[in-house]
Amino acid sequence: IVLRPSRVHNSEENTMRALTLKDILNGTFSYKTFFPNWISGQEYLHQSADNNIVLYNIETGQSYTILSNRTMKSVNASNYGLSPDRQFVYLESDYSKLWRYSYTATYYIYDLSNGEFVRGNELPRPIQYLCWSPVGSKLAYVYQNNIYLKQRPGDPPFQITFNGRENKIFNGIPDWVYEEEMLATKYALWWSPNGKFLAYAEFNDTDIPVIAYSYYGDEQYPRTINIPYPKAGAKNPVVRIFIIDTTYPAYVGPQEVPVPAMIASSDYYFSWLTWVTDERVCLQWLKRVQNVSVLSICDFREDWQTWDCPKTQEHIEESRTGWAGGFFVSTPVFSYDAISYYKIFSDKDGYKHIHYIKDTVENAIQITSGKWEAINIFRVTQDSLFYSSNEFEEYPGRRNIYRISIGSYPPSKKCVTCHLRKERCQYYTASFSDYAKYYALVCYGPGIPISTLHDGRTDQEIKILEENKELENALKNIQLPKEEIKKLEVDEITLWYKMILPPQFDRSKKYPLLIQVYGGPCSQSVRSVFAVNWISYLASKEGMVIALVDGRGTAFQGDKLLYAVYRKLGVYEVEDQITAVRKFIEMGFIDEKRIAIWGWSYGGYVSSLALASGTGLFKCGIAVAPVSSWEYYASVYTERFMGLPTKDDNLEHYKNSTVMARAEYFRNVDYLLIHGTADDNVHFQNSAQIAKALVNAQVDFQAMWYSDQNHGLSGLSTNHLYTHMTHFLKQCFSLSD
């Protein structure tokens, strides 16, 4: 199956050229997507190419600039946010990245009614998070770990919390582990639908052990970065949820929301908060042993001025075969009655599907079913539910958007995207306006990405928002590799793989094989998406075959595959990569003396273990920023899949699954180990320990560190990294430079 954009065949083959590494490093063939910034049922904002902020009205067809590029430039703004009453815009500048999602910035408020910046009671700097209320123009922001509220942009602020302290107490923003492994956001505060209440989380990191690493910078002495970071089994943050009435916040003060008794009895996490109405809120909690989740619906009691979370409104989700949920526990999408909701969780056959919960989870009505998985609920209106799944044609690596009519009985299902641009588009996401009056579809491939606007009632395409014409033209004279997505059936396990083949691929010839692996729990590498990246170059120019394989532990193919790795990370993921390689060799076009494997992060862990498997399959391999022992990684992530590193739990497998334990087995492979010294996520410690074990075992290996670089190895390091890895692979495969 060739999953590539069709183009007119050029008879003059010599005008076609292969991809170069420079193309990749320069981002020559990057694509654009168009996500409307919806501000009503029929209006959206978009930042034009020349940086004007333009308001589009779909129904009138009119558009006008609400904020000029001149105003944006006057404060060097890189982002903006319109207040819901459309009177003010915040402009964001001085962006300074912290962790994966978090950053600080300077904010200016621009008054659209008089065309001036708001003077007096300006916002402090730098701010950690800022957002408008959902109605009007109240502002909530976090500064120095404390939350502040402004009734109007020009008003003085009201300080809601006072105990915020760097690396100790976090109000309204997550600490490191909650940001990375639980919330996946830079914020931990949530406005109620009409802005009456503001809910926020307080994270107490006082007792968490600190990871410290050197940041070399340019000074005479390096500085030390300290992050409260709970590794597996360590003390975790203590979380509390508060809600404050924003009309008169000085009166009652923040009210703590009670934790369900069955959760509070031992260590626990808060996992998400969903407002239902202004006076009803839904909180999700998770036991530290992450197989029990509780969804708690709480109501505001006006007479008591308190939040009441009755036991009758607690819904328990438990997994007996693995952990609760997929990567995260899913969040509920409430229906119009403000008490029943739709939620994705495993059905009795072990596939994640949409369920409708009216009273108890036990009485849940299953909305979707089949040997495929529902992946995301986008929107529930009074008569429709929009969701994505990988049902169509039984390809787990696809995403199509479906509509279920919930207003009629029996509910009818329609695939909105399956036949729109079938060859070009098999992997979609969507963005809906208020009441799903309109929506944008963003197609990521396998062909060149395209974004389109649709009528929410008829699903009719209204217009193309972005079709990447320039990219299409630029690719016309490029010899792109061929891609195929197929499956292997091995011992009752289905292994889906993507193979990237050189442009002039000939099955009768032998090619070097590079396995690219991630393999982390609930991940998916084999997806029908467009990409022109490093491995595209390796196939196009260097004539390598590249394969990606989704083995046990990966997502969207049912719980049997997903939970197979529960409590034994580092075993089946590696086995399945090896099994796939053996199958690829059997196909006859792989040079079995030239097989390599590489991966980053979890993929670096898997590639290291595969190289040290003792199979003799791999000639060489690369691990970028690998985990080397699960005792070194974050508690929230690690314990979800591995339990605790204690004698009475799973310490034995923690010890058995380290890369260091296999140091001897690296003797017969060429190993390139790479890590950034300022990696806040997978600490440099991981690679330092691998290197130490290899030295102690007197095993030769290659290594590269990137000073002051984090887990992403960005900027100039990226160029150096890919150039270095290219040289390493070409040398391994005896390819001339």
Partner: antibody
Framework: EVQLLESGGGLVQPGGSLRLSCAAS????????MSWVRQAPGKGLEWVSA???????YYADSVKGRFTISRDNSKNTLYLQMNSLRAQDTAVYYC??????????WGQGTLVTVSS | EIVLTQSPGTLSLSPGERATLSCRAS???????LAWYQQKPGQAPRLLII???TRATGIPDRFSGSGSGTDFTLTISRLEPEDFAVYYC?????????FGQGTKVEIK
């Protein structure tokens, strides 16, 4: 009907201690922030301290380190432990319902006299 | 801390007359955090106005509040005999919350 009843006031020497209590009824005490406000003889009102429903405490600079506010939600009672008392702490002490403002219910007050 | 200055210190008026009490803040106060109280001799204060202009529960409509920023006003449209007392403005914008020194409304 909401009622706040202070007790524990009296005459104390400078440097001495007193513990004021405020018994609350007629509302869900455990859900509300509560404050102590004082009024020196013939003078205006001065906020002293507050405590959230969840127990976080706030103090005026003039009493910080000497006074401790606390609550026992099971007994519906608010306390103010006053140590190292000074002459300028002489006042009628009111317990009030609220955190930093909108004090909608007040007790009748208890007089604290600090004198040698 | 925010200093609230009330004026006049004393207001001598007759029943039935209109009383206008002023409260000036040393720095800007958002309307949501400005309250007014009434206190009679030997009694605890009583909440009159919240959010600068909203009457508290059970407060007669002859009491009204207005203002924003640094200048706030309490108006009693027609003084009743029971209205003669000391009136305090109070801000809850910042810690510590502070009260004005009070305006005494006395019978002329």
């Amino acid at each position: 009907e909401v009622q706040l009843l202070e007790s524990g006031g009296g005459l104390v020497q400078p440097g001495g201690s007193l513990r004021l209590s405020c018994a609350a009824s007629g509302f869900t005490f455990s859900s509300h922030a509560m404050s102590w406000v004082r009024q020196a003889p013939g003078k205006g009102l001065e906020w002293v301290s507050a405590i959230w429903a969840s127990g976080e405490q706030y103090y005026a600079d003039s009493v910080k380190g000497r006074f401790t506010i606390s609550r026992d939600n099971s007994k519906n009672t608010l306390y103010l432990q006053m140590n190292s008392l000074r002459a300028q702490d002489t006042a009628v002490y009111y317990c009030a319902k609220g955190w930093l403002g909108n004090f909608d219910y007040w007790g009748q007050g208890t007089l604290v006299t600090v004198s040698s | 801390e925010i200093v609230l200055t009330q004026s006049p210190g004393t207001l001598s008026l007759s029943p039935g007359e209109r009383a206008t009490l002023s409260c000036r803040a040393s720095q800007s106060v958002s309307r949501s955090y400005l309250a007014w109280y009434q206190q009679k001799p030997g009694q605890a204060p009583r909440l009159l106005i919240i959010g600068a202009s909203t009457r508290a529960t059970g407060i007669p409509d002859r009491f009204s509040g207005s203002g924003s920023g640094t200048d706030f006003t309490l108006t009693i449209s027609r003084l009743e005999p029971e209205d003669f007392a000391v009136y305090y403005c109070q801000q809850g914008q910042v810690i510590p919350p502070t009260f004005g020194q009070g305006t005494k409304v006395e019978i002329k």
